[in-house]
């Protein structure tokens, strides 16, 4: 029961986490700039991984995708890659974990197979969460290092001057969504790995057992001792015999024709 609950909770937490990672990746507010009060209008600028937007004091908002890969910080490409890898791994993990759920019965799937699938999905969630946390952290670090512009960086361009507009950076909402979502996915993955331990059949090392039939009518049935999972009603794993079974330590040795005096 505890394993099913842990597995189910891990799945739900990971599901929420991955939904959050997807949301963060799509959000426009990764970084927000309160631009200097433009003489024409107060301008509020914010950027995402895929496009940047401007909101004027009038309320007018416009967003445009980045014109070209050139002129984009290399780190932005790395963040995009990390977030996409996180989403892909998380999505595969979700797919695998659905089939691994103990409460869902698919054909005659062994507990060991479900345990393996649970572990696989758990590892995928952990890596997915780490990718998201890493991506968001790299972006945050990029903001801290690149956006401290005490003076506008001026250089000569064709036909005049071009300068980077002086800004005061702030972390956008997407960063916080990403950090929380990555954390949840990570926690969900850990829970799945913990659940896997409970699902896995116990490798019990039984002593070798020799059977002595007390009567001619008693036949030995193979597979009498199977390892128990330790969960649920163990109907199949009952001893075949109550009597007649002794460990090798208890077996009495009887004289035979090969015994020498």
């Amino acid at each position: 029961m505890a394993v099913t609950a842990c597995q189910g909770l891990g799945f739900v937490v990971s599901l929420i986490g991955i939904a959050g990672i997807i949301a963060a990746t799509c959000m426009d507010q990764w970084s927000t700039q309160d631009l200097y009060n433009n003489p024409v209008t107060a301008v509020f600028n914010y950027q995402g991984l895929w496009r940047s937007c401007v909101r004027e004091s009038s309320g007018f908002t416009e967003c445009r995708g980045y014109f070209t890969l050139l002129g984009l910080p290399a780190m932005l490409q790395a963040v995009r890659a990390l977030m996409i890898v996180g989403i892909v791994l998380g999505a595969i993990g979700l797919l695998v974990s659905i089939f691994a759920l103990k409460c869902i019965r698919i054909g005659s799937m062994e507990d060991s197979a479900k345990a393996n699938m649970t572990l696989t999905s758990g590892i995928m969630f952990i890596v997915s969460g780490l990718c998201a946390i890493a991506g968001v952290s790299v972006f945050a670090n990029m903001l801290v290092t690149n956006f401290w512009m005490s003076t506008a960086n001026m250089y000569t361009g064709m036909g005049g001057m071009v300068q980077t507009v002086q800004t005061r950076y702030t972390f956008g909402a997407a960063l916080f969504v990403g950090w929380v979502a990555g954390g949840l996915t990570l926690i969900g993955g850990v829970m799945m790995c913990i659940a896997c331990r409970g699902l896995a059949p116990e490798e019990t090392n039984y002593k070798a057992v020799s059977y002595h039939a007390s009567g001619h009518s008693v036949a030995y049935k193979p597979g009498g001792f199977k390892a128990s999972t330790g969960f649920g009603s163990n109907t199949k794993n009952k001893k075949i015999y109550d009597g007649g079974a002794r460990t090798e330590d208890e077996v009495q040795s009887y004289p035979s024709k090969h015994d020498y005096v």
Partner: nanobody
């Protein structure tokens, strides 16, 4: 490469009119903010007039009622119609385009400037 080229400057008598034009290449004329600035000899560059993609228009107090800013999407230009010119309007007029969308780092582009001299 973004290029802003101003034209239309020259010598004009006080009370006269002049139309400045800023041709933008490599940039959408509906850039987030398009503006005109001027710099008189020995003075700092000051804002004259500007418009935004959202339609907000603003003028410096010293030119209100005399100057009109407009944009021509067909020609990809931003124009500044200057009427009732005064000697204190003498300056080098610069076209400015500020781009916040479509670029990760907000950028400000400047033209080379065109000289306007108001003198009798």
């Amino acid at each position: 490469q973004v290029q802003l080229v101003e034209s239309g400057g020259g010598l004009v008598q006080p009370g006269g009119s002049l139309r400045l034009s800023c041709a933008a290449s490599g940039v959408d004329i509906s850039s987030d903010v398009m503006a005109w600035y001027r710099q008189a000899p020995g003075k700092q560059r000051e804002f004259v007039s500007g418009l935004t993609r959202g339609g907000s228009i603003n003028y410096a107090d010293s030119v209100k009622g005399r100057f009109t800013i407009s944009r021509d999407f067909a020609k990809n230009t931003v124009d500044l119609q200057m009427n009732s010119l005064k000697p204190e309007d003498t300056a080098v007029y610069y076209c400015n385009a500020e781009i916040y969308t479509g670029t990760f780092y907000p950028r400000s582009y400047w033209g080379q400037g065109t000289l306007v001299t108001v003198s009798s």
